[in-house]
Each structure stands twice: as C-alpha cells, then as structure tokens.
C-alpha cells in the first residue's frame, strides 16, 4: 500500500480467483485512543473498533472511503483505491489502446518544435468519475524538471455505439536546450483514477522523435506566363524553431486531382517554392518535415488550382 496523495492510498492487488488478497492496516489519525469505530462509505455498519482497523482487500467491494469516528464525530478518512494486477500484468482498462505506432500505445505525444514544449493525449470511453494527474521529467535516475499543466477534455467523438473522449496535456521542459543532442529521454507518467480503480501509464521519448511541424503557412500560387505551370510559394510555420538556417525543413509538394484515384504528382524540395503543372480542378498541397531527422510530416496546407 502506498499514498497517492493526502488520505488517498493505493492497494496493489495481485488478483486471481480465490486470491487471499492484501492485508491492510488502517490507522485513525487522532490522539484519541478509546471509543473509536470504523465505517465504510455511507454505510452505518460498524466494521471494527479501536485506533487501527485490519482489513483483507480482495476486490473492489473492499475499497472505498474508510472513516473512523468517536461519539458521532468524524476523526479521519482513508480512501482506498485498487491497482489490480492479473497474470502479472497491471490493468489498463481506463485508457484505450491507440495501436499507433504500435500495440499498447496508450499515450501519444507530439512537439511542434525543439523548444521543449510538447503535448500528449489519450483516449477513453469513460465519461464520469474520472481524474488524471500528469508528471514528467527528463531521465529517471537523476530527473530534470518538466512542468505539465492539468489534463483537459479536448475532444469528444462517436465511434459506432461508443462515445470516445480525448484528453490532452501540455508540458514544458524547464531548462530546454533546443540545439543540444538529447541523450536522456523525456518520461511522461499519467495517473488515472476511475471510481475506485487506479492505473498508471507511461511514455518515454526523445523530443526529436515526436517532432511534427505545423503545416507551411501563407501558401500561394503565381501563374507563369504562357504556361500551365505555376510557382507555388510558402513560408515556414510560425511555431517552428529558429533560426531556420539551423532548424531547417524539407517540403513535399503534391498536385492532386479531384478524384482520389487520379495519379498524384509529387515534388520534394528544401526551398520554399516550387514550379508545378496545375491541372484543372486539381489542388496543390504542401507539407513539411525536419530536414535532417526523419520524424513526422506535418499535415498538408492546400490551395485550389483555379
């Protein structure tokens, strides 16, 4: 058993049918010695008397808020949550496996640049009685500080007969050095509590691996005289690291017809302009990627040819 926060404790339960459970000793936080009784949640049934209460925690029915009283007065509370392990594996019931980029991916994180700021998000089908707490550091043995805000509900969507909720959190490395080579990964830890169930989820990554630039901005077309060709130009996104001579991007320019089946013409360039043939009813799209490290491409910025 360990303390999650004041008066909230997590019992780690290795569960299997007929498991003996965990013996837990609760101590009433009071100088009083006599006349103390214990109850669970809203029930008035007395579970025991004395300054300590020993319970056998076998299942969620044994978790909840234990309260010690004396003469009708509440002395202290202890909320017991369960962290359940089955077949040697901690439960992961609260969050949905996003399966991207691989199975058992519960947390996904992205950074728009090398400033040390990043966003993580996760999915759940649970709508009520749910709380999250996020901690982060660089490295784990001698951790360097990363500050995370509060997790917030960022999107809701319907998937079949299911409603899915997306939560996200923003974090900032306290002493980020954008140009430095990373040797220790960022660690992100999310505590999730649903009703009386505690679970924790972790992700470990280098900022360079989660980079996803914003789309190029100010995408413009300039027709070339007496030609079907156009000059496409764009700019680096405002959120990208500076100077651009050091933090350079490469770009992919795509001409796409109205029909998804039509052949796509693609040009790759390190410049912020390109000359392409603009077909009728086509659109031109440009996306960006770090020039020197193959992390994610940005989303597309698009303009119609007409």
């Amino acid at each position: 058993i360990w303390e999650l926060k004041k008066d909230v404790y997590v019992v780690e339960l290795d569960w299997y049918p007929d498991a003996p459970g965990e013996m837990v000793v609760l101590t009433c936080d009071t100088p009083e010695e006599d006349g103390i009784t214990w109850t669970l949640d809203q029930s008035s049934e007395v579970l025991g008397s004395g300054k300590t209460l020993t319970i056998q925690v076998k299942e969620f029915g044994d978790a909840g808020q234990y309260t010690c009283h004396k003469g009708g007065e509440v002395l202290s509370h202890s909320l017991l949550l369960l962290h359940k392990k089955e077949d040697g594996i901690w439960s992961t019931d609260i969050l949905k496996d996003q399966k991207e980029p691989k199975n058992k991916t519960f947390l996904r994180c992205e950074a728009k640049n090398y400033s040390g700021r990043f966003t993580c998000w996760w999915l759940t089908t649970i709508s009520t009685d749910l709380t999250f707490s996020v901690k982060s550091s660089r490295g784990s043995s001698d951790p360097q500080g990363v500050t995370c805000g509060a997790a917030t509900l960022s999107a809701e969507r319907v998937r079949g007969d299911n409603k899915e909720y997306e939560y996200s959190v923003e974090c900032q490395e306290d002493s980020a050095c954008p140009a430095a080579e990373e040797s220790l990964p960022i660690e992100v830890m999310v505590d999730a509590v649903h009703k009386l169930k505690y679970e924790n989820y972790t992700s470990s990554f280098f900022i360079r691996d989660i980079i996803k630039p914003d789309p190029p901005k100010n995408l413009q077309l300039k027709p070339l005289k007496n030609s079907r060709q156009v000059e496409v130009s764009w700019e680096y996104p405002d959120t990208w690291s500076t100077p651009h001579s050091y933090f350079s991007l490469t770009f992919c320019v795509q001409v796409q017809g109205k029909s998804k089946r039509e052949k796509k013409d693609r040009v790759f360039t390190d410049k912020t302009s390109a000359t392409v043939i603009c077909r009728k009813n086509a659109s031109i799209s440009v996306r960006a990627q770090d020039r020197y490290y193959s992390s994610s491409w940005s989303e597309w910025a698009s303009v119609p040819c007409s």
């Epitope: 049918p17 299942e59 969620f60 029915g61 019931d93 079949g160 007969d161 299911n162 009386l196």
Partner: nanobody, 123 residues
C-alpha cells in the same frame, strides 16, 4: 445508457438446471464488466457472480461456486448464468448488472441493472 433484459427464469425441482440470459442494448457492451445478483423476499440483494469485460476472468460467491457458471458472448451482447444442482435456497429474483469495476461483489459498484427474472426451486 445500457439497457439490460433478463430471461430464462422459471420453476424447477431441486437438483435440476436452468440457464439465465441477459441481453444488453445501448452503449458498447464490451466496455462493461457484467454481474449477476439475486434477492429473496425480505433480504438484501446478494452477489452471485461477475465476469470481466473480455470474459477471461470470473468471480463467484462461495454459495454458488462449483454449481453456477457465468459466461458472455460479446458478439451477441449477452451474458449467461448456467445454474446446475439447484437448491431451494437458490430461490430468488435474479438481476443482471453492468459496471466498470472487476471484480466487485458490491451492488453499488454496478451502474446499470435489469428488472430481474424469478427463479423458484421446489423441493
């Protein structure tokens, strides 16, 4: 919301078998742990059995262990309770329940309940 409808109750002789079904509709059935409870007249609702959302783990009250088997078919949105070697003391209204804490024998850990089906075991 999850709607639960029990069926399969009836009157049987001691020693006989009965299979209860609980059909779920509404939100995704496979997100819920399912349980069976029972209530005899003048008594509190009593835990019988529960099954995890994927059906890989089960949990039983001592009074039914070895006689009752809980199972589920997520493709059919249905949970079953196979009851064998029935005894007169198994007579009760049997309720199906859906929750998100497994295992729990406590009724208030379940969020949705059916209307119940009567099982009567005569000696």
């Amino acid at each position: 919301e999850v709607q639960l409808v029990e069926s399969g109750g009836g009157v049987v002789q001691a020693g006989e078998s009965l299979r209860l079904s609980c059909a779920a509709s509404g939100r995704s059935f496979s997100n819920y742990e399912m349980g069976w409870f029972r209530q005899a007249p003048g008594t509190e609702r009593e835990f019988v059995s529960t099954i995890s959302r994927r059906g890989s783990s089960t949990y039983y009250a001592d009074s039914v262990k070895g006689r009752f088997t809980i199972s589920r078919d997520n493709a059919k949105n249905t949970v079953y309770l196979q009851m064998s070697s029935l005894k007169p003391e198994d007579t009760a209204v049997y309720y199906c329940a859906a929750g998100q804490l497994f295992p729990s024998s406590r009724p208030r850990d379940y969020d949705y309940w059916g209307q119940g089906t009567q099982v009567t075991v005569s000696s």
